[in-house]
Amino acid sequence: QAGPLPKPTLWAEPGSVISWGNSVTIWCQGTLEAREYRLDKEESPAPWDRQNPLEPKNKARFSIPSMTEDYAGRYRCYYRSPVGWSQPSDPLELVMTGAYSKPTLSALPSPLVTSGKSVTLLCQSRSPMDTFLLIKERAAHPLLHLRSEHGAQQHQAEFPMSPVTSVHGGTYRCFSSHGFSHYLLSHPSDPLELIVSGSLEGPRPSPTRSVSTAAGPEDQPLMPTGSVPHSGLRRHWE
């Protein structure tokens, strides 16, 4: 007897972080024997969508013409061949930005910092939120994640960086979110340019102290894995 059908590949175009109202296409690629493709959303009461394959039958397109809260979440896809349903694909996490008003990002004491010194990026929201995310442009894994403990909501989160090196220089944005859905983020803050001056080049920062730069796809948001207590918030990195 043949083994289980190989799992399909699932991805989103133009990416998996989509602004409210924008369109996104989810693709599921299986095999040429596929007769039907099914997209399941985590904790949905029924199959999320089902599509016939596009010729030559090895993939299907699931279109979202206008991104809303309904579509944010974690997806897997399957294909059905004459011998049954495949294994599930690896999950795709579709994140919607624009769910809440934008926070403010600032640098303390200043966005101009000398190499070897300390700087704290401060993300502040108008209304209390329980999750704050820091994004660095063009970083492979562009995010730090602070979540308040015990669901306590706060107006701000601090992202300390010490000691600062040239690696920290660049453009940052932050987002805020509510804990009930990690897939719904605020509008992004206005960008903050962190400029690192001086030639003191220290060691590469450890992920517990600054922005993670682990390799990974640009459009995939980091989801929380590890944590350490930090001033009423939990810090998560990957």
Partner: antibody, heavy 122, light 110 residues
């Protein structure tokens, strides 16, 4: 037109079993999920169970989990509810209701049958 | 277990707008609860109205609309008709099971 017809109800003693059927017509049965929902005399609705279009997923209310089994035979356009270890509180009219092809197409509970009465009494 | 609460009864007049709500004991109703609305007419005739992802059942008049208002799900009948007199049930999804509310009896005084 869409039709759902329940059968198999009746009077049964506590602890005994009963199997309900729901015959579907007027739509492609094998592409839709189907629910069982019940209504005790003079009470509101209580969701019982759902089965996906191909039988791959089944969900149950806590009150019936481990006692009731939902199943379907797509070749016969028929849904079943096997009810074991029946209790007095299972007394109700049992309805089957159509689910969706998928969440982005359709509305759960759009079409309902007329119901079949199950009375659990000694 | 989650409890879903609805107004027990509401009265309106033809042409008026009436809003029914559906509250969850677990907190705010969100899009992940996939709020559903079902109408019961006399003789236990049930019909789905609205649900899934803001879909309306084909044939259901446009005066019926669903939404989230504050922390509750809502069914609004804009310009009620006498034939809208019925009991309306909401159902919310909780990760692996549905829970129905107790139903709202809507009376349309002609």
């Amino acid at each position: 037109q869409v039709q759902l017809v329940e059968s198999g109800g009746g009077v049964v003693q506590p602890g005994r079993s009963l199997r309900l059927s729901c015959a579907a017509s007027g739509f492609t049965f094998s592409t839709y999920g189907i629910h069982w929902v019940r209504q005790a005399p003079g009470k509101g609705l209580e969701w019982v169970a759902v089965i996906w279009f191909d039988g791959s997923n089944k969900y149950y209310a806590d009150s019936v989990k481990g006692r009731f089994t939902i199943s379907r035979d797509n070749s016969k356009n028929t849904l079943y509810l096997q009810m074991n270890s029946l209790r007095a509180e299972d007394t109700a009219v049992y309805y089957c209701a159509r689910d969706v092809i998928s969440m982005v197409r359709g509305v759960p509970f759009d079409y309902w049958g007329q119901g079949t009465l199950v009375t659990v009494s000694s | 277990d989650a409890v879903v609460t609805q107004e027990s009864a509401l009265t309106t007049s033809p042409g008026e707008t009436v809003t029914l709500t559906c509250r969850s004991s677990t907190g705010a109703v969100t899009t992940s609860n996939y709020a559903n609305w079902v109408q019961e007419k006399p003789d236990h005739l049930f019909t789905g109205l609205i649900g899934g992802i803001n879909n309306r059942v084909p044939g259901v008049p446009a005066r019926f609309s669903g939404s989230l208002i504050g922390d509750k799900a809502a069914l609004t009948i804009t310009g009620a008709q006498t034939e809208d007199e019925a009991i309306y049930f909401c159902a919310l999804w909780y990760s692996n099971h549905w829970v129905f509310g107790g139903g709202t009896k809507v009376t349309v005084l002609g």
